[in-house]
């Protein structure tokens, strides 16, 4: 029977800068029941606070609701593991909520084959930003990535769309059914999951780009 091993806070994520959750990995339990607590303070403060919500994020997590979440202030947090034989502390983790946003996937993905008379045909892809993200304030810049592939193909073709919410693709295989998905990330933050796939049938008379 031993004191617990050192835990590690390994991930923090926010869907929208208004709330966030951090998760830790326990160390070894030393063969005894072990209790974990997360404490934190904000930069410039000395007053320590305990995690406000150990439930919402699941096991080994701490959730910070709206009233506990401040943008532009660094949180300094650590996890304490305690059993009958002693305690151990994680390294301190410095967290700025602005930098840990992982948005929901983009919405309203629409895909259409365009065949203008005077130009090459192309695939036109359009989407909307996720609803929880407020782009109007200027706090967020969202970047987008598209992936597509013929239905039976193994490899995805990836296109970086920057900040735009529509994109044209010229080189496609005529007669194939394509899957198209889009994802987004803040300029500092994490990629969302891919949106649900949209299927599009490319006409047999679609002319490949030279």
């Amino acid at each position: 029977q031993l004191p617990p091993g050192k835990p590690e806070i390994f991930k923090c994520r926010s869907p929208n800068k208004e709330t966030f959750t951090c998760w830790w990995r326990p160390g070894t339990d030393g063969g005894l029941p072990t209790n974990y607590s997360l404490t934190y303070h904000r930069e410039g403060e000395t007053l320590m606070h305990e995690c406000p919500d150990y439930i919402t994020g699941g096991p080994n997590s701490c959730h910070f609701g709206k009233q506990y979440t401040s943008m532009w202030r660094t949180y300094i947090m650590m996890v304490n593991a305690t059993n009958q034989m002693g305690s151990s502390f994680s390294d301190e983790l410095y967290v700025d909520v602005t930098y840990i946003v992982q948005p929901d996937p983009p919405l309203e993905l629409a895909v259409e084959v365009k065949q203008p008379e005077d130009r090459k045909p192309y695939l036109w892809i359009k989407w909307s930003p996720p609803t929880l993200i407020d782009l109007k304030t200027g706090w967020f810049t969202l970047l987008y990535e598209i992936r597509l592939k013929p239905e039976k193909a193994a490899e995805w073709e990836i296109h970086f769309a920057g900040q735009q919410t529509e994109f044209k693709i010229l080189s496609l295989h005529p007669g194939q059914k394509y899957l198209v998905q889009v994802r987004c990330k803040p300029d500092h933050g994490y990629w969302s999951a891919w949106s649900p796939a949209t299927f599009i049938q490319i006409p047999s008379d679609f002319t490949m780009n030279d």
Epitope: E8, V95, I100, W191
Partner: antibody
């Protein structure tokens, strides 16, 4: 204990490439951005670029954009910096540096440095 | 890019005295400034982040101040181990940039 251990010194010819490695231990590699900073002999520090090892998303100093490639191998917790088309003024100590937290780019842990000498 | 200008280039101070190092940014950077200490043959060591926050384990004699474009690192009472080169760094906008350094030497 957090450690960043870099590969050994290199001597390279002008026009060639160099690839410096930085093996991380003591923390979860994918949690923090990794940066590369260089220091020419007797000179100051110059940021070259950064990578998020969780998805290999990277940003570069435009000064090096066409010559530098930063990669990360999650399976070995190792970051790499490759600099191509070397010239004599690339002679420097190259450091990897871990982001201080989940936040802006200040650097709390540094590798020991790798001296790259470019000479004909 | 944002240019960080440090002054003086060299500062001669006696042990036990106060040292005041200056760093000026060519554009507004808010409080997105860090300070590092570097000794010969060693990697830099983080002292201060967000202009005024001491990093974990850094002695209280090191303090940072300033916002906007003008920043100061103060070492209240220099110890023998504090003689080194000090760099400021901005992380307000890409590319992240460092000042040219201030060498603090024994008077």
């Amino acid at each position: 204990e957090v450690q960043l251990v870099q590969s050994g010194a290199e001597v390279k010819k002008p026009g060639s490439s160099v690839k410096v490695s930085c093996k991380a231990s003591g923390y979860t590699f994918t949690t923090y951005w990794m940066h590369w900073v260089r220091q020419a002999p007797g000179q100051g520090l110059e940021w070259m670029g950064e990578i998020d090892p969780s998805d290999s998303y990277s940003n570069y100093n435009q000064k090096f954009k066409d010559r530098v490639t930063i990669t990360a191998d999650k399976s070995t917790s190792t970051a790499y910096m490759e600099l191509s088309s070397l010239r004599s003024e690339d002679t420097a100590v190259y450091y990897c540096a871990r982001n201080g937290g989940l936040g802006p780019a200040w650097f709390s842990y540094w590798g020991q440095g790798t001296l790259v000498t470019v000479s004909s | 890019e944002i240019v960080m200008t440090q002054s003086p280039a060299t500062l001669s101070v006696s042990p036990g005295e106060r040292a005041t190092l200056s760093c000026k940014a060519s554009q507004y950077v808010g409080t997105a400034v860090a300070w590092y200490q570097q000794k010969p043959g060693q990697a830099p060591r983080l002292l201060i982040y967000s202009a005024s926050n001491r990093y974990t384990g850094i002695p209280a004699r090191f303090s940072g101040s300033g916002s906007g474009t003008e920043f100061t690192l103060t070492i209240s009472s220099l110890q023998s181990e504090d003689f080194a080169v000090y760099y400021c760094q901005q992380y307000s906008s890409y590319p992240w940039t460092f000042g040219g350094g201030t060498k603090v030497e024994i008077k």
